[in-house]
């Protein structure tokens, strides 16, 4: 299933992750998928 609003898929962690965490960790792989 696609990730819910405000989250994005992380291939590194194999799960959806909160886009909010990109403030602290902007280089995370899933941040590319966050608006």
């Amino acid at each position: 299933a696609p990730c819910s609003r405000g989250s994005s898929w992380s291939a590194d962690l194999d799960k959806c992750m909160d886009c909010a965490s990109c403030r602290a960790r902007p280089h995370s792989d899933f941040c590319l998928g966050c608006a």
Epitope: G6, D12, L13, D18, C19, A20, S21, A24, R25, H27
Partner: antibody, heavy 119, light 111 residues
Framework: QVELVESGGGLVQPGGSLRLSCAAS????????MSWVRQAPGKGLEWVAE??????????HYAESVKGRFTISRDDSKNSLYLQMNSLRAEDTAVYYC??????????WGQGTLVTVSS | DIQMTQSPSSLSASVGDRVTITCRAS??????????MHWYQQKPGKAPKLLIK???NLESGVPSRFSGSGSGTDFTLTISSLQPEDFATYYC?????????FGGGTKVEIK
């Protein structure tokens, strides 16, 4: 399933030292920030120290109340977190929790280990 | 440091009641998109458990009767219909900057 297991707590005299350990399993330890949070008897939660990732050069941060006395470290090869506590004071008496989180909210918590500083 | 003020410090309620706990930060912990405020539940003798992150995101496995709202400096945790297993102490925490700080806690007791 995720598990964090703390050990190393006990009774120590004021001025003494103690080393806490936390064994992690069930998640990608090397990708997660880790902290120690403590709770004095009958009191609320207090963040103590944080360690970030190898890619952050294992950056550490401390509460003012423990700065210069406590040292947080990690061994990603052993999925383990540590807290070296020196110059212990009565006010350091608390249950110490190991916590893990990708960032921000503390998703994973251990069961805690009790540290008692008393003569 | 950012101070977190939780209220009330304790409350008595009955099963089925709607319960509201508030947390006020001494400065804003929000961007235009996200709020860096989180809520935990702790039962006696147990470790805290994450309930809600980023002000309103329910953690997986947490019952939908729990909800969070707010932005800026003022935040709320609501339990829509209190259940026997919800009697516990609740804490807010910000992650805006270091040091991370927690609210003083709200103990929810049986009336």
């Amino acid at each position: 399933q995720v598990e964090l297991v703390e050990s190393g707590g006990g009774l120590v005299q004021p001025g003494g030292s103690l080393r806490l350990s936390c064994a992690a399993s069930g998640f990608t330890f090397s990708s997660y920030w880790m902290s120690w949070v403590r709770q004095a008897p009958g009191k609320g939660l207090e963040w103590v120290a944080e360690i970030r990732l190898k890619s952050d050069n294992y950056a550490t941060h401390y509460a003012e109340s423990v700065k210069g006395r406590f040292t947080i470290s990690r061994d990603d090869s052993k999925n383990s977190l540590y807290l070296q506590m020196n110059s212990l004071r009565a006010e350091d008496t608390a249950v110490y929790y190991c916590t893990g989180y990708y960032a921000d909210a503390m998703d994973y918590w251990g069961q805690g280990t009790l540290v008692t500083v008393s003569s | 440091d950012i101070q977190m003020t939780q209220s009330p410090s304790s409350l008595s309620a009955s099963v089925g009641d709607r319960v509201t706990i508030t947390c006020r930060a001494s400065q804003s912990v929000s961007t235009s998109s996200y709020s860096y405020m989180h809520w935990y539940q702790q039962k006696p003798g147990k470790a805290p458990k994450l309930l809600i992150k980023y002000a309103s995101n329910l953690e997986s496995g947490v019952p939908s009767r729990f909800s969070g709202s707010g932005s800026g400096t003022d935040f709320t945790l609501t339990i829509s219909s209190l259940q026997p297993e919800d009697f516990a102490t609740y804490y807010c925490q910000h992650s805006w900057e270091i040091p991370y700080t927690f609210g003083g806690g709200t103990k929810v007791e049986i009336k």
